[in-house]
Structure formats: structure tokens, C-alpha cells
């Protein structure tokens, strides 16, 4: 029987953020409650001087009026004890975007083609999580080498998220677009 | 955009076997599992089983165990289904329809069936 | 394994109108239940998927709602087009099964 704390859940050791930083597609994503990126997802992570890791992300969001527009985020990551788990602050570049505070944990990565990210947002009483959201990574745009989808269906598995993952569609959405030209 | 192509029929002597095809293009192959589904005619439809193209790691309904074995050929993005010791039960149009690797597996696109027909 | 009981198996209807069709799983499928739509010589197509999500290029006179083991799909303002055999399907449990299906005639 798989245990489905989040306090049982493995990342990355020895997480590396100088071999992280660069540029990460979206291949498949476990939304979480509410509103959230919807596709044409890509993420921008950089390591200043100091050794902070920041981000930035592009993708589709529709809105409650059914408006789609391309949405710019930001990102900044506070680390904690363990190198792979962080606190991430983050907002919309446009006001109306979403702002909040969430764990940014690096569930796996080999930095070079793929990484597995988690994060809950409410744990339930027996210690499960209640609201959660999942990122598959992947350097290449146009996906997953064989072996590197095996090993992501494992931690999919591991992080008892298994099969609620949907594919992100990669279609030019977002290419020379933001909110800021659309509305 | 999406294609999955299949033979339109197949005629087959009692006790034979035979390999339906199921040719891919539009997308990645080895990203999603190729699955086979068959439909006796005026019945439902059945799952037989999956494979996953890039390893050809495969997962069978038990009913269908003894009766069919998944391949595939990734150099023509194409998926195979071989069917044995064939008999009237086996008459049947047999779907292939892909699943997501990463996402929920859901069947989101089906080719359009061949038709096998088991007659002497 | 899972049955899918879909109900009915057959019900006629006029353009313009509304059905609703029913599947009933053995147990809880925890709302992974798609709906498809399948015409002769062609394979099924996808509606809806996790219940009520509707595929791209889908209509929203297509819906679908339910949890547990009971889920229900709906066509509103019915057009030429929609009259057709349509297949629920769980797929919570690996060993796919589908409901027996509806065919949808015109009245």
C-alpha cells in the first residue's frame, strides 16, 4: 500500500539550482483548485550572486469571463533545510493575475531532460494533501525521451497522482504575446 | 493533426491467425500507449490490452491474454495486434485508440476499425 | 473488475431537444468516466472526459456531471448530426470497461 503523506514523499537530493536554472516546457500538469495556467506553459528559472533561485513562466489562463490571455508570472524561491524544497512567492505581471505563497518542492530531475515538480497548498488531518498541483518538465519542447517518461510515471505514482495528470499543448499561443498586449 | 490508420477488412480461415495494423502519425509515437478494443458486431465495445511503443512493456484484459499479442514497429510508427487460433467468436471490428503516457491514459483518438471476419 | 450498466439502450428524440443518458459503475470510478461518440465506419470520438470536461472543438450542448458510481450525459438542442451510438467508459481502473451503449434515433 503506497503511503501518501506528504511528509513521505522523496526530492531530489542534493538539488543543484545553478544546473536547474534555464529554460523548462510543460509537458503535463495535476491542477490544483481554482484558477491556474491552462497551456503553452514555459518556465524560465535563473540563480542571481546570492544563490537565489527566481523564475519566470509563460502561459495560457482563462479567465472567469472566459477571456483567454497569456499570462507572465514571477517567481522568487526562499530555500529551506532540504536544497530541493522551497517557498516560493509568486504573482501575476497584470493585476489581475493570481498572488500567493506555496511549497515549491523538486520531486526529481536530471536537469537535462526532465523534472517532476509538486507542491500542496492544504494538507488533510491524516496528513494526505488535500489541494495539490504537479508540473512534468522537460527541456525539449517537443517532449519526454522513452526512458525519462518511465522514470516520471514513477514519481507520478509515488506522489499518489497517478493518471490525474493532463497533456499541456505546445501550440505558439503565447509566442509575442502577454496580458499586457491582449487586453 | 492526428491519425490513426487502419486496413478496412480482413477475411480469415477458421483456426488461422492474423496481424492488424495500426499506423500512427501527427504526433509522437512513443509518447502515448497504443491501445486495441473490440467490437462483436450489434455489441459493445471491449478492451483487449496496451503497449507502450517505447519499450513495448504491455498490460492485457485476462480475457484476451491467450488470444492476442501487441508489437509494435517504431521505425514506421506503426502497431501491431496478432490474433490466434481464430474462431467466429474473434469476427469482430478491433479499434486501436492511443492514451497519454503522462496524462490520465484517457482513449483520446481511435482509428476507424478493421473489420475481421472468421468464415471457411 | 468494473461494469458499466448504461441505460438506456436505446431512446428516440426530436431536433431540438434533450436526452440524458446514465451509466451506473460497480464502484466508485472517482469521476473518471469519459463519453464518446461512435458512427458507422468510423472509430468513436471523444466528448468528455474526468466526467464533465469537455474535449476541444466539443459543443457545449454536450455535459456531463455525476461522481461516485453514477454519472449522467446530456445533448441539449439536438441537431442532425447527434444521432449516433454513444459509449460511456471508466477508466479509473487500468481494465478499461465501457457501458453496453445508447443509440440516440430521430423521432
Known amino acids: 500500500e503506497r503511503d501518501c503523506r506528504v511528509s513521505s514523499f522523496r526530492v531530489k537530493e542534493n538539488f543543484d539550482k545553478a544546473r536547474f536554472s534555464g529554460t523548462w516546457y510543460a509537458m503535463a500538469k495535476k491542477d490544483p483548485e481554482g484558477l491556474f495556467l491552462q497551456d503553452n506553459i514555459v518556465a524560465e528559472f535563473s540563480v542571481d550572486e546570492t544563490g537565489q533561485m527566481s523564475a519566470t513562466a509563460k502561459g495560457r489562463v482563462r479567465l472567469l469571463n472566459n477571456w483567454d490571455v497569456c499570462a507572465d508570472m514571477v517567481g522568487t524561491f526562499t530555500d529551506t533545510e532540504d536544497p530541493a524544497k522551497f517557498k516560493m512567492k509568486y504573482w501575476g505581471v497584470a493585476s489581475f493575475l493570481q498572488k500567493g505563497n506555496d511549497d515549491h518542492w523538486i520531486v526529481d530531475t536530471d536537469y537535462d531532460t526532465y523534472a517532476v515538480q509538486y507542491s500542496c497548498r492544504l494538507l488533510n488531518l491524516d496528513g494526505t494533501c488535500a489541494d495539490s498541483y504537479s508540473f512534468v518538465f522537460s527541456r525539449d519542447p517537443n517532449g519526454l525521451p522513452p526512458e525519462a517518461q518511465k522514470i516520471v510515471r514513477q514519481r507520478q505514482e509515488e506522489l499518489c497522482l497517478a493518471r490525474q495528470y493532463r497533456l499541456i499543448v505546445h501550440n505558439g499561443y503565447c509566442d509575442g504575446r502577454s496580458e499586457r498586449n491582449l487586453l | 493533426q492526428v491519425q490513426l490508420q487502419q486496413p478496412g477488412a480482413e477475411l480469415v480461415r477458421p483456426g488461422a491467425s492474423v496481424k492488424l495494423s495500426c499506423k500512427a502519425s501527427?504526433?509522437?509515437?512513443?509518447?502515448?500507449?497504443m491501445n486495441w478494443v473490440k467490437q462483436r458486431p450489434g455489441q459493445g465495445l471491449r478492451w483487449i490490452g496496451m503497449?507502450?511503443?517505447?519499450?513495448?512493456?504491455?498490460h492485457y484484459n485476462q480475457m484476451f491474454k491467450d488470444k492476442a499479442t501487441l508489437t509494435v514497429d517504431k521505425s514506421s510508427s506503426t502497431a501491431n495486434m496478432q490474433l490466434s487460433s481464430l474462431t467466429s467468436e474473434d469476427s469482430a471490428v478491433y479499434y486501436c485508440?492511443?492514451?497519454?503516457?503522462?496524462?490520465?491514459?484517457?482513449?483520446?483518438?481511435w482509428g476507424q476499425g478493421t473489420s475481421v471476419t472468421v468464415s471457411s | 473488475d468494473i461494469q458499466m450498466t448504461q441505460s438506456p439502450s436505446s431512446l428516440s428524440a426530436s431536433l431540438g431537444g434533450k436526452v440524458t443518458i446514465t451509466c451506473k459503475a460497480s464502484?466508485?470510478?472517482?469521476?473518471?468516466i469519459a463519453w464518446y461518440q461512435h458512427k458507422p465506419g468510423k472509430g468513436p470520438r471523444l466528448l468528455i472526459h474526468y466526467t464533465s470536461t469537455l474535449q476541444p472543438g466539443i459543443p457545449s450542448r454536450f455535459s456531463g456531471s455525476g461522481s461516485g458510481r453514477d454519472y449522467s450525459f446530456s445533448i441539449s438542442n439536438l441537431e442532425p448530426e447527434d444521432f449516433a451510438t454513444y459509449y460511456c467508459?471508466?477508466?479509473?481502473?487500468?481494465?478499461?470497461?465501457f457501458g453496453g451503449g445508447t443509440k440516440l434515433e430521430i423521432k
Open positions: 501527427g504526433y509522437t509515437f512513443t509518447n502515448y500507449w
Open positions: 503497449i507502450d511503443p517505447s519499450d513495448s512493456e504491455t
Open positions: 467508459l471508466q477508466y479509473d481502473n487500468l481494465l478499461w470497461a
Open positions: 485508440a492511443r492514451s497519454p503516457q503522462l496524462g490520465d491514459y484517457i482513449l483520446d483518438y
Open positions: 464502484q466508485d470510478i472517482n469521476k473518471y
